[in-house]
Amino acid sequence: PISAFAVDIPETHGGEGYEDEIDDEYEGDWSNSSSSTSGAGDPSSGKEKSWLYTLDP
């Protein structure tokens, strides 16, 4: 499930690449649409750059 977050954006690193896995616990892209508006990826989980890394290995 993806939820929208406050507007703060930052990291872009690796994790979503495991595309045959499902990440039920991911809380992190900062937008609930496919494009960002004005904020940053502000992951409530505190996971670094979670707005860019959407799947856990």
Epitope: I9, E11, G14, G15, E19, S35, E48, L52
Partner: antibody, heavy 120, light 112 residues
């Protein structure tokens, strides 16, 4: 060796469209977020777009939002930038960049760039 | 948008000297997750930019230890302890804490 090779730059008229491509090699492409960064003729660097590792999420600054679309094809290890409604201020060298990972730097590898010129 | 202001615009140095470049952000760039995504890049003549420092003070792989980054909040500094010929070029700071991500205008390190 990690390599990024851009292609597709050209001279295009204002209002026109162009698609840039970036071929990646030397790393597990699907594990990393990717971005496009451009450098204007005045040598200013501007972030253009970013895409999450799996391609589900994309991010843009307001000045290109709605005109540019970043996408990726993991099978082809390629990154793309579809540009439409081009303006003279989009004239720049466009660099494909690799993200360093969740705890590292944003642009840890850069391609050599491809030149886009928007002029009538 | 977060405005990144670098000073000086040009920095003439003698080889072996220490060099210091300042970068100031128009607002705090501490991300809500606690990290400060402040980075430094070097673009040598005729080349693409290269990452030097990430998260304020972490040297990227292969970057010599004569490069060091420091600062917090809105004020950041890149120091080169002993300038070598290969260090010449344009240095850019970058913030990745708030969208849109933004770069400073650049500081040209050149021989005095």
């Amino acid at each position: 060796e990690v390599q990024l090779v851009e292609s597709g730059g050209d001279l295009v008229k204002p209002g026109g469209s162009l698609k840039l491509s970036c071929a990646a090699s030397g790393f597990t492409f699907s594990n990393y977020a990717m971005s496009w960064v451009r450098q204007t003729p005045e040598k200013r660097l501007e972030w253009v777009a970013s895409i999450s590792d799996g391609g589900s999420y994309t991010y843009y600054p307001d000045n290109v939002k709605g005109r540019f679309t970043i996408s990726r094809d993991s099978a082809k290890k390629s990154l793309y930038l579809q540009m439409s409604h081009l303006k003279s201020e989009d004239t720049a060298m466009y660099y494909c960049t690799k993200d360093g990972g969740p705890r590292e730097g944003y642009f840890d590898v850069w391609g050599t760039g491809t030149t886009v010129t928007v002029s009538s | 948008d977060v405005l990144m202001t670098q000073t000086p615009l040009s920095l003439p140095v003698s080889l072996g000297d220490q060099a210091s470049i300042s970068c100031r952000s128009s607002q705090s760039i501490v991300h809500s997750n606690g990290n400060t995504y402040l980075e430094w890049y070097l673009q040598k003549p005729g080349q693409s930019p290269k990452l030097l420092i990430y998260k304020v003070s972490n040297r990227f792989s292969g970057v010599p230890d004569r490069f060091s980054g420091s600062g917090s909040g809105t004020d950041f500094t890149l120091k080169i302890s002993r300038v070598e010929a290969e260090d010449l070029g344009v240095y850019y700071c970058f913030q990745g804490s708030h969208v849109p991500y933004t770069f400073g205008g650049g500081t040209k390190l050149e021989i005095k």
